[in-house]
Interface confidence: low
């Protein structure tokens, strides 16, 4: 009304996007009867009734309130159901009586926006380049009003810097009303800037107070130039023929340079190109003592053209050569002495060591084994192992077989063999000598030999049990150059019901089994009685 | 493309010397060893000598040691052997040959067309 | 010092071995070389099992202790002519050394 003193600040109502705003009608009784009650929006200073009150009862005017508004406490106040952002404005009551008179109440609307979304740029940056160039886009989505962004390096805010830091940012308006939030952060970075994390934080206002939301931490790829290449080796330590090595280029740039890695003839001193895999390592598997050398690695940058070389690495493949053992093939006889020598090489200090092959027993530490008055029992196998005590599992090892001269001797003397009459036998006779002596028998039957080792022999033979056999018996005799013997197998005939299961009479390698002749072309393990004491 | 052309080969008398050829092209002469490889009428292949890709280093099999000498020039990318006191066993086309980017490791592969030595009286 | 066979010969289409043995290709591996009448050889595999450009597939290369072999799978009548391993001298020097060569016939 003009010439009324100026009208106060409206009331402030603060209320969030979807809840209900309870706009109080703050006339007082003397300001007009609440009974009666016109409520207007004011839009852009255009007022719209929206709602009316007489006689404490409320009707909505038609529009876009229609469906939302209800009255509470006795009429004094206004509901407004389901806020948008486009309720954002200032809402009047206005009492008839006894004169009018207008209450005014400005709606405030808060909607806090999504969690941000970064994203970091893909095809990162150069350190470089001329300008700042984009680092990451912040987005915040569906927020209102627009919040603030503010951008973050290693947790400190980074503020807008000349030629160094710029902050884009720009907001659409959704169709609900709601603002989407971009901002850009573009930076000139350096190279230690390659592990910054970089994260953006939305601050915004709700009823509640303010409020805000951090990003997820993002690095940036930041490219720089190659400084300094060098070679690494893994696995790191001694290393040993038969090992997997892996001889990889490292370098300070980002994206590294194109590697090759180059050996240093020993003979030419030039450095020759090796190949490398896929991935620019060279794989050595299994490494050989002639791997060993000199290696660099050349980066070559593929942009500059600039090539830098990597300080020489060293490279020891450590090795043991082939033992050697002499005499090579040692023939002995009886009651003579004999030294057996080993000798290998290595790129480290070797231990040796002699071993009874058969037993496993060490006898004797060192390169030298020196054996006395030979017994034909000394005869077999010997194993010189050379080994790198400083590097496990570096070692080498040669077997040299003793001969000693002598006739045959036998893996028993005679046995007792229980059997049944018509059943097919196996029997087995082995022998030893020098030189390695043949095996035959006294009977007809299947016989077959196989060469144990290069002084001892074993056959075995099928036969049938026949009354003539059972008195006979059956004979192996082994022969070489230097004399012969023989073993003797008793058979005896023994009822089966009477067998015990897994008993054995069976001495040095020898087995025996029986079946039914009536399935002669099968055998299968015979039980024996327990031999007696007595050989017979 | 790679090419090595030999010249130099020819009749001499027993007692007499050669000098081979073989320039190269297509390839960074300085950066490679050479070779010598020879092969008698009907005969096997026979290596002779080798040089490393700076001159430095140069190898001779048992047979010509001390009377046969390699050697390049790689201003003028060529590769050289000269020959002495020469024997009728030292018959043969005598080849060039380039060693692989590997190294020696992976032999040679490039070879010159061969020049024929005779060493007749 | 590389010891190979004098002769092979293999039907038409069939697959052949060529071998070579000697102490240096315990530490080395073989080249391999064809050569035919009146033309320089050319390498055909060299290091484990690698053929240079231009070489056929047919073609491959293994080794086992002091054994090197040169297998033809499927020889065609271009591939008759003679075949030379060589490798480094076991010795540890700088020398190189080739095989007595393996004539191969295909029939």
């Known amino acids: 009304v003009p010439g009324e003193a100026e009208q106060p600040a409206p009331e402030l109502v603060e209320v969030e996007v979807g809840s209900t705003a309870l706009l109080k009608c703050g006339l007082s009784q003397s300001q007009g009867n609440l009974s009666h009650v016109d409520w207007f929006s004011v839009h852009k200073e255009k007022r719209t009734l929206i709602f009316r009150v007489r006689q404490g009862q409320g009707q909505s005017e038609p529009g876009e309130y229609e469906q939302r508004l209800s009255l509470q406490d006795r009429g004094a106040t206004l509901a407004l159901t389901q806020v948008t952002p486009q309720d954002e404005r200032i809402f009047l009551c206005q009492g008839k009586r006894p004169r009018s008179q207008e209450y005014r109440i400005q709606l405030r609307v808060y909607k806090a926006p999504e969690e941000p979304n970064i994203q970091v740029n893909p095809l990162g940056i150069p350190v470089n380049s001329k300008e700042p160039e984009e680092v990451a886009t912040c987005v915040g989505r569906n927020g209102y009003p627009i919040p603030q962004v503010i951008w973050y390096k290693n947790g400190r805010p980074l503020k807008e810097e000349k030629n160094r830091v710029h902050i884009q940012s720009s907001q659409t308006v959704e169709s609900s009303g709601l603002y989407t939030l971009q901002s850009i952060l573009k930076a000139q970075l350096v190279k230690e800037d390659k592990d910054a994390q970089f994260y953006c934080e939305l601050n915004y206002r709700l009823p509640s107070g303010n409020h805000m939301k951090e990003s997820r931490e993002v690095t940036v790829p930041v490219f720089y130039p190659t400084e300094k290449v060098w070679l690494e080796v893994e696995p790191v330590g001694m290393l040993k023929e038969g090992d997997r090595v892996e001889i990889r280029c490292l370098a300070d740039g980002n994206p590294p340079p194109h590697f090759s890695i180059s050996k240093q003839n020993p003979s030419t001193r030039e450095a020759e190109e090796e190949t490398t895999n896929d991935n620019g390592v060279l794989v050595l598997e299994p490494a050989r003592k002639e791997h060993s050398g000199r290696y660099e690695c050349q980066g070559l940058d593929l942009d500059t053209m600039i090539s830098l070389l990597s300080e020489p690495q060293e490279l020891l493949v450590n090795y043991v050569s082939d033992v050697r053992v002499s005499p090579a093939a040692p023939e002995r006889q009886e009651g003579s002495s004999l030294t057996l020598t080993c000798e290998a090489e290595s790129s480290q200090d070797l231990e040796f060591q002699w071993l009874r092959e058969e037993t496993g027993q060490v006898l004797e530490r060192g390169p030298v084994l020196q054996l006395h008055d030979l017994k034909r029992e000394a005869g077999g196998g010997y194993r010189c192992v050379a080994s790198v005590p400083s590097i496990p599992g570096l070692n080498r090892t040669q077997l040299v077989n003793v001969a000693i001269f002598g006739p045959p001797w036998m893996a028993f003397k005679e046995r007792k063999v229980w059997v049944k009459e018509n059943m097919v036998l196996n029997l087995s006779c082995e022998a030893s000598g020098h030189p390695r002596p043949t095996i035959s028998w006294n009977v007809n039957g299947t016989a077959s030999e196989q060469d144990q080792d290069p002084q001892r022999v074993l056959s075995t033979l099928n036969v049938l049990v026949t009354p003539e056999l059972l008195e006979t018996g059956v004979e192996c005799t082994a022969s070489n150059d230097l004399g012969k013997n023989t073993s003797i197998l008793f058979l005896e005939l023994v009822n089966l019901t009477t067998l015990t299961p897994d008993s054995n009479t069976t001495t040095g390698l020898s087995t025996s089994t029986a079946s039914p002749h009536t399935r002669a072309n099968s055998t299968s393990t015979e039980r024996k009685l327990p031999e007696p004491e007595s050989r017979g | 493309e790679v090419q090595l052309l030999q010249s130099g080969g020819g009749l001499v008398q027993p007692g007499g010397s050669l000098r081979l050829s073989c320039a190269a092209s297509g390839f960074t002469f300085s950066s490679y060893a050479m070779s010598w490889v020879r092969q008698a009428p009907g005969k096997g292949l026979e290596w002779v000598s080798a040089?490393?890709?700076?001159?430095?280093?140069?190898y001779y099999t048992d047979s010509v040691k001390g009377r046969f000498t390699i050697s390049r020039d790689n201003s003028k990318n060529t590769l050289y052997l000269q020959m002495n006191s020469l024997r009728a066993e030292d018959t043969a086309v005598y080849y060039c040959a380039k060693s692989h980017d590997y190294g020696d490791y992976a032999g040679f592969d490039y070879w010159g067309q061969g020049t024929l030595v005779t060493v007749s009286s | 010092i590389l010891t190979q066979d004098p002769a092979v010969s293999v039907a038409l289409g069939q697959t052949v071995r060529i071998t070579c043995q000697g102490d240096?290709?315990?530490?080395?591996?073989a080249s391999w070389y064809q050569q035919k009448p009146g033309q320089a050889p050319v390498l055909v595999i060299y290091?484990?099992?690698n053929r240079p450009s231009g070489i056929p597939d047919r073609f491959s290369g293994s080794s086992s202790g002091t054994t090197a072999s040169l297998t033809i799978t499927g020889a065609q009548a271009e591939d008759e002519a003679d075949y030379y391993c060589?490798?480094?001298?076991?010795?540890?020097?700088?020398?190189?050394?080739f095989g007595g060569g393996t004539k191969l016939t295909v029939l």
């Open positions: 240096s290709l315990k530490s080395y591996y």
């Open positions: 040089i490393s890709g700076s001159g430095g280093s140069t």
């Open positions: 060589h490798s480094r001298d076991s010795s540890g020097t700088h020398l190189r050394v």
């Open positions: 290091g484990k099992n």
